[in-house]
Amino acid sequence: YHGCPSECTCSRASQVECTGARIVAVPTPLPWNAMSLQILNTHITELNESPFLNISALIALRIEKNELSRITPGAFRNLGSLRYLSLANNKLQVLPIGLFQGLDSLESLLLSSNQLLQIQPAHFSQCSNLKELQLHGNHLEYIPDGAFDHLVGLTKLNLGKNSLTHISPRVFQHLGNLQVLRLYENRLTDIPMGTFDGLVNLQELALQQNQIGLLSPGLFHNNHNLQRLYLSNNHISQLPPSVFMQLPQLNRLTLFGNSLKELSPGIFGPMPNLRELWLYDNHISSLPDNVFSNLRQLQVLILSRNQISFISPGAFNGLTELRELSLHTNALQDLDGNVFRMLANLQNISLQNNRLRQLPGNIFANVNGLMAIQLQNNQLENLPLGIFDHLGKLCELRLYDNPWRCDSDILPLRNWLLLNQPRLGTDTVPVCFSPANVRGQSLIIINVNVAVPSVHVPEVPSYPETPWYPDTPSYPDTTSVSSTTELTSPVEDYTDLTTIQVTDDRSVWGMTQAQSG
């Protein structure tokens, strides 16, 4: 194929691939008709002047996972047809000015996973057709004003996994076509007002895993097309009342792992496309009336691992579509009998690891489709007569690790449990805590000196798809989640979407954040 170097493979489709540690320089001669060239996993340390001079038809050039630390400014001369250039996963610390000059057709430039310390406006001033710029996984500490001013056609910019401590409010001002902006895993402590004002076509904004403490009230007011907003794992302590008010297209919002203490009513402005809201691992202490009332389409609401001690009776107003509600690992002692009244479509509710002492008899009155209830590890001594009687689809009920008081008042509950044993699961059964003479004995078979009618154990509906809620105090560092870190569920077949099995047998959620470029 017009002379293929011995250390490369060349296909009929004008594709050339050169790999292997024995390669220490760009192989020659490269076939003049090559349209795609990949140089991967070699020991090339530098690119000298014009190594690709004779392959001017090249459209895609990947020089990845090498030892490349130095590039001569004229290395890419004569590649006017090049549309895709990747220098990812090398050891570049410095980019020479003018390196990309003459690459008039370049649309994608990948410089991720190098050791770049800085970028300058002159680096990209010639790349007027660039649509994608990947700079994640470098050592950038700041972005100078004007760095991206000439990239007016840019649609995707990834600056994640750098060391950025602040962002100038002007740095993105000319990127009116930008659809994806990723700034995750930096050291940003605040975002100046106006930073995103010019990004009228932005669809995804990734700010997770920074150190952001405050959000300016109008920070997202110009981003009406925003669909995905990631704010998790920051230090956000409060949300300005209007911060999310003008995001009608939003369908993903992550706020977990912050320091939120309260949520004001209507804070989540009309978001008709938002179906899941993850608020676990904050410091929320109470939920006022109508706090989620604009989220009419919400299906999954995760509020676990907060400090919630009070839920106003109308807190869940408007959540008519909700299927899963996680309130586990909070500080709840009491619940109003009407708190779940509006949740007509709720299937799974997670209330374990609280301090609930009692439940109102009507707590589940209007939630007829409930399939899974987790009440383990609370302070329950008894439950009201008939509390579960109308829940014909209930097939997962967890009651263990409560201080059940096994006196004569427990008999109605004991009889119901006896009839509904399969719903309790096989792992852990509720046991008596008092009186002392029966402590530790199974609540289901305890003899309370009252004749028990013979029972027929009914067939229980098949197990539901149960929810997954965060439970873990610590996160694994690894980005690989294997079967050893599999979530165990409070429900038999419903693995908590956030759990890793730790030292005790409780289901706990371990989170891993990884974002592909």
């Epitope: 299927r323 798809e465 997954w468 599999e486 959620w509 954040q513 990884a514």
Partner: antibody, heavy 119, light 110 residues
Amino acid sequence: EVQLVQSGAEVKKPGSSVKVSCKASGFTFTDYYIHWVKQAPGQGLEWIGLVYPYIGGTNYNQKFKGKATLTVDTSTTTAYMEMSSLRSEDTAVYYCARGDNKYDAMDYWGQGTTVTVSS
Amino acid sequence: DIVLTQSPDSLAVSLGERATINCRHHQSVSTSSYSYMHWYQQKPGQPPKLLIKYASSLESGVPDRFSGSGSGTDFTLTISSLQAEDVAVYYCEQSWEIRTFGGGTKVEIK
């Protein structure tokens, strides 16, 4: 371009295990649910379970609990399904598929991996 | 599990004619906002392809001759004017509880 590329066909002995991979590209892997679906020869579709790569959380169809194990490796944007204690009735094409939210439809599918269990 | 009953099992329709496939189950999979019912097309040797989500929302890139309707327990997929490339097996799926699929309807040209 969104793609889910699955590993190649496997022939396994009864009692053994198989691990099928599903390499994702063209989208943010951690931001979508990955489902697994079984299709036995000449049969319909059967949902096995799902995994949420962002946190590694899983849900299973009770029928496949203990049979299938779903995992992810976010560093390589790959989802895995391991099937253990294989029997002839596990012979099927297995698909991975992507869903935006937990209850949403599966909008992109892998090409399928044929697993044949035969002595 | 929610059992989905698809009918008919197979359907032969002339080119340009309307094809109608039904999917029924014994309990509702709808709320006031959504019906948790989706439709897929599967051609031989290929994976399923999403056509309709949430009962009536046409997936991006799917020709508008495909439409979905229904709520509660009864749903319908309609191909308004059958084309040669529509020959396939069609499946409904519910995501209300543990996901289940209908048995499939094979659509052929008469």
